[in-house]
């Protein structure tokens, strides 16, 4: 078993919470069985853990909030993996676990005697996980011993039912709004005919199927609809892309309700099948606007359109953030197996030294260069100040007129902290409202995201439009450069005056063969051509009948 | 159906055009490759133009050879002709309309004699 | 660059014989091989496509197989009408090649 899952980053307080974070990449297919994870993660990783660090202290340092309480974190790797997380949230409840027992004098030596061993303080509620599939998992375990979680970035439509995930919370909004903002871009550009692909687990699966139900009732057809993990191998992604190239070029469309890394996938499989440009992606939110999914495929990505979750960058992160050293930084135990990765260079004399870079890391690289905000960190940020207002509540309620922890709220009740959590209301990072519906909800506000290739070898994603409350505004001109540039994704271009659709057997209603109705017939319904009646003609227009005009012959009339 | 036109004998550095006219199905539908063959020696494959309009080539025909397409025609057009291009060139459509799958309808090939 | 690498280059076999001819891809590529048939002034007719499907109208003593990097065309009960060159073709990308076909493999009827 790897040994990096074991490593845990500590800040002391009289309250702790958990933080789980994919500061590494997932488990590729053959290392799965060891629960080995993968290279280390900025955005989705470090710069979580030291969101969660940095934030913790500013809530410490306000007076207002909390008074006489010093929260406390303990975060641990998910590796955006189920069993890791699980793993690591099973670290979090023998926490607990421990004690209470000790609350109640449980601990007891092997030889029987007392211990002096002071345990660590019980975990009150976690923050993350970032995937949907490893939340439901860690929601799972975490309920049993009710500790409320609250989510970042699972957006699963699942984990809006509270009879199943009672301690599950989250300031994002469930994934029906996103594919509804999708269907309502496809409808727009009316593109009848597009194919889907989803990641297998639960974020994909729950948002695809939502996609293809509200496109079902708007009309639109789904060529075929694949899926496919997001750590798949080389071949599974060809395979996928030549089923895709089989519906060419009638369905240009590929909706994506995919993570980013299984875009990412599907980029690098076009370029090895030469089949950049021949697919527009639409992405949802696990795509949104990240850099780490584009890199060096941005050929491939040019013109895909995706969703994104309302959440301006945190320039007090970044003033914190881009500050940061090894030489200081000993809080976070991944910063130095991070900094030797994000500049490819070995920390000479670190404890963390890794032989594998040839390079020393020199004293003038700073994380200025080429810094990308994470894109959920206001989400991230949201979370944590949700949790410290939700104490904050509790104590205000259960500690009136005292400061700090009184006994009334030793130890913390979890089903306590999740009422006074599901009443809170407070002004977020960005200044928007941060409030949860009966399901633990928050409401959606989504920007559209366009990747165009800005100049000679440069791309960039631009805001091209918004979806707030069921209501979408699209710059098209940004999009289009001109009405004739808009793809086409059709299975049939209609018919011509005087001609019916024809739908052949097993075939999806968007796809017909246009057949002319007989030279007696007019054009009942789009699906029917009627006889006229004995005495009657087609109109010009074929869309009726009208009387043949009674001509009487006379004796001398030439034969017509 | 494919058949190919414009073969022809021409002196070395002398541009050539070849036409593939298409009949029966539509060019937006799928790929058309152009190959050649060398008198005596193996098939060749000079380059695709998917039903989108990209184009890819071999990289030894890169620069050389461009393909561009009408509604009904596929055109080949060849620069800087040695004797080593000497071949009867076919066009073939693919089965898909983008990447390279399989070839499925052939012409029957034009002659291009390049000799001083 | 994606290779093709076919042998042997010519093969002699008898009337009702088995011949064996073998393509080598230089990368994995997955299914995607499809052989082909040349008889002298005749364009190539497609026999078999992903590796092992029989294309319309060919006869079932023509076997495709094989996966990955190693793919071969058998012939059983070989017939005079089936002397003739024979192509392997990588169906897999059409980027950065110098070929998509195999040298060809002269089938000799005796």
């Known amino acids: 078993q790897s040994s990096e899952r074991r490593v845990v980053a500590h800040m002391p307080g009289d309250i702790i919470i958990g933080a789980l974070f994919s500061v590494h990449h997932q488990p590729t297919v053959d290392k799965v069985h060891e629960r080995k994870c993968g290279a280390v993660r900025e955005q989705y990783g470090i710069q979580r853990v030291e969101a969660m660090l940095h934030t913790l202290e500013r809530i410490n340092s306000d007076p207002t909030l909390l008074p006489n309480i010093t929260l406390g974190c303990e975060i641990r790797d998910s590796c955006w993996h189920s069993a890791v997380a699980l793993e690591q949230s099973i670290e979090f409840i023998r926490d607990s676990l421990i004690s209470s027992e000790e609350e109640e004098g449980l601990v007891r030596c092997v030889d029987g005697s007392s211990s002096s061993f002071r345990s660590k303080k019980p975990i009150v509620g976690v923050i993350g996980p970032g995937s949907s599939s490893v939340a439901i998992q860690v929601q799972n375990l975490l309920q049993l011993f009710n500790i409320p979680q609250i989510a970042y970035s699972a957006t699963s439509m699942d984990l809006s039912d509270k009879t199943l995930f009672k301690y599950f919370m989250r300031v994002v909004p469930s994934d029906a709004q996103q594919a509804r903002a999708m269907v309502d871009i496809v409808k727009r550009y009316n593109w009848t005919y597009v194919s889907a692909v989803h990641t297998e687990g639960n974020y994909g699966e729950s948002g695809m199927e939502a996609f293809k139900d509200m496109s079902a009732k708007e009309g639109i057809c789904i060529a075929h609809s694949y899926k496919i993990y997001s750590n798949a191998g080389e071949q599974s992604f060809d395979k996928l892309l030549k089923k895709l190239t089989s519906h060419l070029p009638k369905a240009r469309v590929v909706a994506c309700f995919c993570e980013g890394m299984t875009v990412r996938g599907l980029l690098m499989a076009m370029r090895r099948l030469g089949l950049a440009g021949e697919f527009l992606l639409l992405g949802s939110d696990g795509w949104a606007d990240r850099y780490d999914v584009t890199d060096g495929y941005q050929r491939e990505a040019v013109g895909g359109i995706t969703i994104k979750l309302q959440s301006p960058d945190v320039k007090w992160f970044d003033d914190y953030y881009l500050k940061l050293r090894p030489e200081t930084n000993h809080r976070n135990p991944w910063f130095q197996e991070f900094w030797q990765h994000r500049f490819q260079c070995r920390l000479e004399g670190f404890p963390q030294e890794n032989s594998k870079y040839n390079k020393t890391c020199n004293s003038s690289l700073t994380l200025k260069t080429h810094h990308v905000q994470d894109s959920k960190m206001g989400f991230v940020i949201n979370a944590i100040y949700s949790m410290a207002y939700g104490l904050h509540n509790m104590q205000m309620s259960l500690c009136p007129g005292y400061a700090g922890l009184c006994d009334a709220m030793k130890p913390i009740d979890g089903r306590k902290l999740l009422e006074s959590l599901m009443k809170t209301n407070f002004t977020g990072v960005s200044g928007d409202t941060i409030l949860f519906d009966e399901n633990g909800d928050s409401p959606g506000r989504y920007e559209i995201m366009n990747f165009k290739e800005m100049g000679k070898d440069y791309f960039d994603y631009i805001n091209v439009g918004s979806w707030d409350n069921g209501e979408l505004k699209m710059d098209d001109d940004e999009v289009w450069s001109k009405k004739s540039n808009i793809i086409r994704s059709v299975c049939s271009e209609p018919c011509e005056k005087g001609q019916i659709k024809v739908i052949r057997k097993g075939e999806v209603s968007c796809c017909w063969t246009c057949t002319p109705c007989k030279e007696n017939e007019y054009v009942f319904d789009e699906y029917t051509c009627k006889a006229c009646q004995l005495g009657s003609w087609p109109t010009d227009d074929l869309t009726g009948c009208d009387l043949i005009p009674v001509q009487y012959l006379r004796w001398g009339d030439p034969e017509p | 159906s494919v058949e190919e036109s414009g073969g022809r004998l021409v002196t070395p550095g002398t541009p050539l055009t070849l036409t593939c006219t298409v009949s029966?199905?539509?060019?937006?539908?799928?790929?058309m490759n152009w190959i050649r063959q060398a008198p005596g020696k193996g098939l060749e494959w000079i380059g695709i133009?998917?039903?989108?309009?990209s184009t890819y080539y071999a990289s030894w025909a890169k620069g050389r050879f461009t393909a561009s397409k009408t509604s009904t025609t596929v055109d080949l057009k060849m620069t800087s002709l040695t004797t080593e291009d000497t071949a009867t060139y076919f066009c073939a459509r693919d089965e898909l309309a983008a990447g390279i799958n399989y070839f499925t309808l052939w012409g029957q090939g034009t002659l291009v004699t390049v000799s001083s | 660059a994606l290779v093709m690498t076919q042998t042997p280059a010519s093969v002699e076999v008898a009337v009702g014989g088995t011949v064996t001819i073998k393509c080598q891809a230089s990368?994995?590529?997955?299914?995607?091989c499809s052989w082909y048939q040349q008889k002298l002034g005749q364009p190539p007719k497609l026999l078999i496509y992903e590796a092992s499907k029989l294309a319309s109208g060919v006869p079932s003593r023509f076997k495709g197989s094989g996966s990955g990097t190693q793919f071969t065309l058998t012939i059983s009960g070989v017939e005079c009408a089936d002397a003739a060159t024979y192509y392997c073709?990588?169906?897999?990308?059409?980027?950065?090649?110098?070929?998509?076909f195999g040298g060809g493999t002269e089938v000799v009827v005796k």
């Open positions: 133009i998917y039903g989108s309009g």
């Open positions: 990368q994995n590529i997955i299914d995607w």
């Open positions: 073709q990588q169906g897999y990308s059409p980027s950065g090649v110098d070929n998509v």
């Open positions: 029966g199905f539509s060019l937006n539908n799928y790929a």
